[in-house]
Structures are given as C-alpha cells and as structure tokens.
Interface confidence: medium
C-alpha cells in the first residue's frame, strides 16, 4: 500500500530493492501526560514489542578482534503492549521463572509501566513521523557503515524468539553517527503485520508500512548492553520501512527462505553471512533522527533512532512469508508484533534533508517550524 504523496521526491518516496545497494535520565511523567500504550481502536494498530540483546545474561562486548566469534546475545525479556480489546489476541503470554520482565502478552495485564517504570517515560518509541514538522538539519551527514558486507563464513544465528526473527551479528560491523558517536552492530530483527494489515512500528503521518527492519547498535563507549541502557546515545537503531514491490528482494530472500526452519518459537538455524547493508535502503543520506527508547520493556530511553526516508521493496510473496510463517507461544501465529506509536512530548524529529518541503502546488513557501541545533563537520 502506498499513499498518493509517496512520490520519488517526497519524504519516504521511491523504494529501494536494498540489493545494491542514533535526554537525560528516565523522566517519569505525571498521570496526565502518561504516554498511551495503545492506539485508539483500529484494525491497523495492534501494538507489539521489540527485541534486543538481553539484560539477564549480557556478555561483555569486547573490542573487535579477528579471533572473536559471534556475540552470543540472549533476548531481552519483553512485555507486549495491550492491544485493541475488540481484536483477537495473537499471542499468549510467556513465562520465564523468576523473571518478571519476561511475563508478557498482547493485550491486558500487566501494564507495561508495572513491568518496567521506564515504559511510562516521556520519551518513548516508536513515534509517528510528520515530515512537515521535522527540523531540517544540514549537519546530519550521510550515514557511513563499515564491515556490513559479511563473507558466507562464519555462519550467523537466525532465531525465532517468540516475538520476532532475529539475526545475531558478528563483531566488526561499525556505524558512525558523528563526532565521537561510534557504534557496533549487535543484531537485527523485523516487525510485521498480518495478511492485509501493515505492521511497521514507526508511522509516517499516521501511515503504517507493511513491515520494518531494526539494526541495533551499541555505542563503543560501553562494553556491555546493560551499561548502555538508559544512557543518552548508548544504543542506536537503524530503522527502515519495508514495502511491497514488483520484484523479489534477493538480499531478504537469503533470510526469508529459511523461516520455515524456525517456524516454532525458540527455534534457530544457521545462515551464511550476507551483505547486511543490502537489507537497508541504498540512500544513506536522507533520514529522520530522534531520541527515543526501546520499544519493549525495559523501555530504556536515550536510544538514537535513525529512520531512513527511502523504503526497501519486497515482493508480495516475501511479505506474506514474513507475516505468515512463524509461530509464537501457545499455538499462535507470530504476527502484528509492533508497539503503538508514542507521543513526542516536545521532542523534535530532525531530518537530514528538507523533508518539510511540500511538493504540492499549494505550497508557495515551505514552512519549517523547528530548527536544528546540531553542529556540522
């Protein structure tokens, strides 16, 4: 599905096959400004959760060396946001003995803030991106990724963790967001919907895309994920929207073709190394950036989100495979695994390009309501 405004020169226009081509302490709100944990009832908006390297058993992330193997990152315990009470629940709850944060389900109790108080923070993710209100920031230069083109060996772990499909990444994938802001990629995972129902986490002017990829990074300033949680810029996520296109995306096919092997919750397989950057849009120069949070408990804030303007195209069959192959806990399909959008609460989303320029003939002068404070080269 594409909105009429999704043209090549407008924000989020022009898809990419992807083949060739990151606030201080937790700020808990008062009752009146608590972020909503669910969208108003609507068929597109069943919220879900995020998957990140775990808190329980976090290994040290050592400096890169040629001898190191893959990081063995366990899943972060997650809790799902309540869904629309009118909708059937897609997942049952999951228990992990002695671990409060792993007891979760779509819809109903427990409320997220009870599981992790940070989930009631003022600066949460995902958010709705409104390009017209984004602050054009020329200092946001093209993203640079290093070492994302992986050889077939060593193979990588692809896992159905019950709430997403996650690919654990080896050491050596580096990403830079600016001066002194260097990151190592840890893992990537996807969020999706169900048949005929989109499932991206972020939205653009209320429009939800079919799916979304997240590549999760740890700042090189921290040796462990648990040290970085809640620290400004401690974690950074690259996010891209997945859309339907006419052709099969060969990069994604390398993962999607293996989903049947991990249909059961908790199952995993090994896949050959691949070009991770090919899973992202080819245009690294046009993106939105804001500071938010993990999209599941512990909902730690200080996460730098970079959302690409360009989308990635997958075929209809591929999107169907993504949303219709995996199973979650309790004989339920793993679908609609996204959290509701959260209020900005005064945050400004920055854009690396003039996203607020309306291409329609009605706009004589582009209105830029917000300004960028970042420094350049």
């Amino acid at each position: 599905q594409r909105l009429p405004r999704m043209q090549e020169d407008s924000p989020l226009g022009g898809g990419s096959s992807g083949e060739d081509d990151p606030l201080g302490e937790e700020d808990l709100p008062s009752e009146e400004d608590s972020p909503r944990e669910e969208d108003p009832p609507g068929e597109e908006d069943l919220p879900g959760e995020e998957d990140l390297p775990g808190e329980e058993d976090l290994p040290e992330v050592k400096p890169k060396s040629e001898e190191e193997g893959s990081l063995k990152l366990e899943d972060l315990p997650t809790v799902e946001a309540p869904g629309d009470p009118q909708e059937p629940q897609n997942n049952a709850h999951r228990d992990k003995e002695g671990d409060d944060q792993s007891h979760w389900r779509y819809g109903g109790d427990p409320p997220w803030p009870r599981v992790s108080p940070a989930c009631a923070g003022r600066f949460q993710s995902p958010v709705d991106i409104r390009p017209q209100l984004a602050a054009f920031c020329p200092a946001l230069r093209p993203l640079e990724l290093l070492g994302f083109q992986l050889p077939p060996l060593p193979e990588l772990r692809l896992r159905n963790n019950g709430h997403s499909v996650q690919l654990t990444l080896p050491p050596g994938l580096e990403m830079a967001l600016g001066p002194g802001r260097e990151y190592r990629a840890l893992q990537l995972h996807l969020h999706w919907g169900a048949a005929g129902r989109p499932g991206s986490e972020h939205t653009v002017e209320g429009h939800r895309f079919p799916a979304e990829i997240h590549v999760v990074h740890l700042s090189t300033a921290f040796a462990r994920v648990d040290e970085a949680l809640g620290r400004p810029g401690g974690l950074a996520v690259l996010a891209a929207f997945l859309e339907e296109g006419p052709e099969e995306n060969s990069a994604y096919e390398q993962l999607l073709s293996r989903l049947e092997e991990i249909a059961e919750e908790g199952s995993e397989t090994q896949v050959p190394g691949l070009d991770i950057s090919a899973l992202l849009p080819s245009d690294f120069s046009r993106y939105f950036q804001y500071e938010g949070s993990l999209t599941t408990p512990p909902c730690a804030q200080g996460v730098i989100w970079t959302v690409f303007n360009q989308t990635v195209m997958l075929s209809a069959k591929q999107l169907h495979t993504l949303s219709d192959t995996l199973w979650g806990p309790g004989d339920s399909r793993l679908q609609l695994n996204f959290r509701a959008t959260q209020p900005l609460n005064g945050r400004v989303i920055e854009a690396s390009f003039p996203a607020g320029v309306d291409s329609s003939p009605r706009a004589a002068e582009p209105v830029q309501l917000n300004s960028c404070l970042a420094a350049g080269d």
Epitope: D20, D21, P63, K64, R141, P142, E144, L145, L146, G147, F148, Q149, G172, E174, A176, L177, G178, P179, G180, R181, E182, R184, T220, A221, A223, D275, S277, S282, F284, S285, G376, D377
Partner: antibody, heavy 119, light 107 residues
C-alpha cells in the same frame, strides 16, 4: 586550525623497530577516528592501521598484523604506531590522518614521516 | 579485498576544460567512496565523501557521482591549481583500499 605532525621515522635495518608518533592539535582529538596510511614510491596509498575514538576498536592491514600496534593517548592528543620486525617492503612515507567528524573518510592528513627499511 | 581501478592513469586537459575521472570497484561499495587530491610533495586532501558530497571548503567545480561499482569525479572547469593526482578510496569494508590514481596534467 587542525594540525597533524608525524615524527619517529628514519632508517632502520630489517627486523628492527620504530615508533611513529602523531601530535594532533586544533580539534577535540578524543572525538575522532584516526588512521595511519602509507605511500610507497610507485605504489598505491595503503591503509596500515585504524583506531576508533576511544581506542576500543583497532584495524590492521593483514601484512602488518602481529608486527605493528596502533594506540592513542587522548589526554596527550597523540596517536602512535609501534612497528616491530620491520621489512624492506614497509619502506614508505607514513601519514597520520583524521577521519571526518567521526566517520570513515579522512579529512586531514599530516605531512608524513619517512620510514626506510634497508640493510 | 575490494580493488579500486582508476582510469585513465593520466589525463591531459587544458585550463578551463572539463575533466572526468573514473573509478571502478571490484564489488559493490554502495556510496562509501571518497576522492582525494594530492599535489607533489603534499599530503592528500579530501574532496568528496559518500560518493557525491563535497567536503567543507571544496569549490563547486568539483563534483562526485555514482554508486555501487562505478564512480566519477568531475572537475567542470579546470583551474591551474587543479593539476594534481586524484585518488578514489572505498571505505565500505576493511581493508579500505585506494585506486592507483589519475594524474591530471596540463595539455
């Protein structure tokens, strides 16, 4: 004004050692990725070693791995390259370079220090 | 390792004319390419990064284009100070590699 000044080069016999230094000024050194690049006569520029802003990530060219060690002292605004077991093929002009605002392309280079390995 | 091949090795151009320098990567490097200028006895100077972005202070006559495996540096109207060697470099994957260079000389 950004300045990078290399020192420590010279003539050394095969198997010998040298320690190159790069003194940086005019910018917040601790924010920047830094590299050593060499240029031998009639040969291509070659990235020898790189180090991220906090020193936690290092890279070495395969042919120097185990022989060269890159390090930095952010308190002293200095970058170093300890070169051991030097070979004739290490003869080159060695440049210290700063990476553009933490990224991977190099925006400032020193004037270089010459290393000659010969018996 | 990714091999960067520059052509031509030497380009003879008259001042005021346009110069087009080519750089081909042996595999896809997306847009992770930089262009440098080096004059005799001097260190390299960054002109272009991310394939098409002019670095701060670089004159508008220098432009970069391309993605994937084929890249071009164009100097729209050569000035006397532009006669030098030009190198492309990929920084998509280690080892970062440079092209062999194109020497732009006065015709």
């Amino acid at each position: 004004e950004v300045r990078l000044v290399e020192s420590g080069g010279g003539l050394v016999k095969p198997g010998g050692s040298l320690r190159l230094s790069c003194a940086a000024s005019g910018f917040t050194f601790s924010n920047y990725y830094m590299s050593w690049i060499r240029q031998a006569p009639e040969k291509r520029l070659e990235l020898v070693s790189a180090i991220n802003s906090d020193g936690g990530i290092t890279y070495y060219l395969d042919t120097v791995k185990g022989r060269f060690t890159i390090s930095r002292d952010n308190a002293k605004n200095s970058l170093y390259l300890q070169m051991n077991s030097l070979r004739a093929e290490d003869t080159a002009l060695f440049y210290c370079a700063r990476h553009r605002s933490g990224y991977f392309s190099m925006d400032y280079w020193g004037q270089g220090t010459s290393v000659t390995v010969s018996s | 390792e990714i091999v960067m091949t520059q052509s031509p090795a030497t380009l003879s151009v008259s001042p005021g004319e346009r110069a087009t320098l080519s750089c081909k990567a042996s595999q896809n490097v997306v847009s992770a390419v930089a262009w440098y200028q080096q004059k005799p006895g001097q260190s390299p100077r960054l002109l272009i990064y991310s394939a098409s972005n002019r670095y701060t202070g670089i004159p508008a006559r220098f432009s970069g284009s391309g993605s994937g495996t084929e890249f071009t540096l164009t100097i729209s109207s050569l000035q006397s100070e532009d006669f030098a060697a030009y190198y492309c470099q990929q920084y998509r994957n280690y080892p970062w590699t440079f092209g062999g260079g194109t020497k732009v000389e006065i015709k």
